[in-house]
Amino acid sequence: EVEKTACPSGKKAREIDESLIFYKKWELEACVDAALLATQMDRVNAIPFTYEQLDVLKHKLDELYPQGYPESVIQHLGYLFLKMSPEDIRKWNVTSLETLKALLEVNKGHEMSPQVATLIDRFVKGRGQLDKDTLDTLTAFYPGYLCSLSPEELSSVPPSSIWAVRPQDLDTCDPRQLDVLYPKARLAFQNMNGSEYFVKIQSFLGGAPTEDLKALSQQNVSMDLATFMKLRTDAVLPLTVAEVQKLLGPHVEGLKAEERHRPVRDWILRQRQDDLDTLGLGLQGGIPNGYLVLDLSMQEALS
């Protein structure tokens, strides 16, 4: 091992304070005791150390805790967290939501880094499920967090956690993810009355089956076109013209602008043209009068 440089006389740090920002890297290495640093980590964030100085402080902690930092240190890492690698973080056992919040705060405003992703993974695995408080915290910092999870990971989200989800948290979710989230949302909001229920369930409807859409059409919900366009095509196809008209209410006029896009295009192809004509929107492409319409499932049975 290389012999370490001795600390110059009078420079031995008695505590972590602003005077250390004027220490050269080798002076920090020589004059700051690792145990002192560990007990006063809460001060590091209030001191504008350079990135090079933070490297030295990290090295001291790594030497003190080769098996991974204790949570008392992790909670106060502050900007030093940005120096950690995913490998470092995998050694940690983070159990406190306060610790998680403190570290997410450091990365606030930036994309989710590999370090943050590893930290979240360690935290959620440690808890066993995505409870409401955790989900609340994660979506507050990363609105797209929920949609970054696989359907398998989403299956561990308890229905009670769905209350923490905001519409923007689901913006980037694909149908497979909404298929998992929708039944949980339905369960979470089941005791709400009609209009309140629709407001809450609306963002999740991309995972709704046909029978639930039919039920909603009986409740004067006036679904907007943006929501309708996110519905599963296979769920929309069996809806009748009358049901779609009731589902959309005054927004039904928006179908004309979307007639070339799925699911509207595919739905139009399944409707009788004379039924479409009753809407008075000039929708074209329906089944001409007199043609036999076979249900898809029936066609499969026949073939």
Partner: antibody, heavy 117, light 110 residues
């Protein structure tokens, strides 16, 4: 909410020794360096002294070195400045301030010390 | 440690931009990115507006910005408003772990 409240000012005879206090709330007092800054009537701000989180390190401006002692009681969340041998030029509003990222991020409303016979 | 040098006064009309300079030495402003700016309204405590040369504390309008070149730091206020009228002080941390202030600049909004 961070709050700093100074007290102990008033009229002091030349050569007097007032002790200023600053009661603090709203943050973890023991984790932060604290500072005293003064402002003579119509004059510049002048940094006076600072003390590190647990009181191990203290720093003074040349103008008060040897005549003032900064201290803190972390159990009471209170900062002190003991001033001795006061002169007319020490007349000023004295502010206590919290040091964050090497800047004074929160200040009290100040306490006026007037040195006059 | 001598005070940092600031112009005694600057003025500007509402909506305009103004810049206040703060000149130090190589042992304070020039050596470290530890320059702060404070706003002080008459009879009030100073308020931190900029720290570490160009960073804004939360709650401070983005009309306030800071920069540094060599031994001189600058505070720029854009879209001047009546409530910006105040005294502005710069300060720098020094290598002797002390703080040095400027003598302040009185900003008048015409």
């Amino acid at each position: 909410e961070v709050q700093l409240l100074e007290s102990g000012g008033g009229l002091v005879q030349p050569g007097g020794s007032p002790r200023l206090s600053c009661a603090v709330s709203g943050f973890t007092f023991s984790s932060y360096t604290m500072s005293w800054v003064r402002q003579a009537p119509g004059k510049c701000l002048e940094w006076v002294s600072a003390i590190s989180g647990s009181g191990g390190n203290t720093y003074y401006a040349d103008s008060v070195k040897g005549r003032s002692t900064i201290s803190r009681d972390n159990s009471r969340n209170t900062l002190y400045l003991q001033m001795n041998s006061l002169r007319a030029e020490d007349t000023a509003v004295y502010y206590c301030a919290k040091v964050g990222r090497a800047a004074l991020d929160y200040w009290g409303q100040g306490t006026l010390v007037t040195v006059s016979s | 440690q001598s005070a940092l040098t600031q112009p005694p006064s600057v003025s500007g009309s509402p909506g305009q931009s103004i810049t206040i300079s703060c000149t130090g030495t190589s042992s304070d402003v020039g050596s470290y990115n530890l320059v702060s700016w404070y706003q002080q309204h008459p009879g009030k405590a100073p308020k931190l507006m900029i720290y570490e040369v160009s960073k804004r504390p939360s709650g401070v309008s983005n009309r306030f910005s800071g920069s540094k070149s060599g031994n001189t730091a600058s505070l720029t206020i854009s879209g001047l408003q009546a409530e910006d009228e105040a005294d502005y002080y710069c300060s720098s941390y020094t290598s002797s772990s002390t703080v040095v202030f400027g003598c302040g600049t009185k900003l008048t909004v015409l």
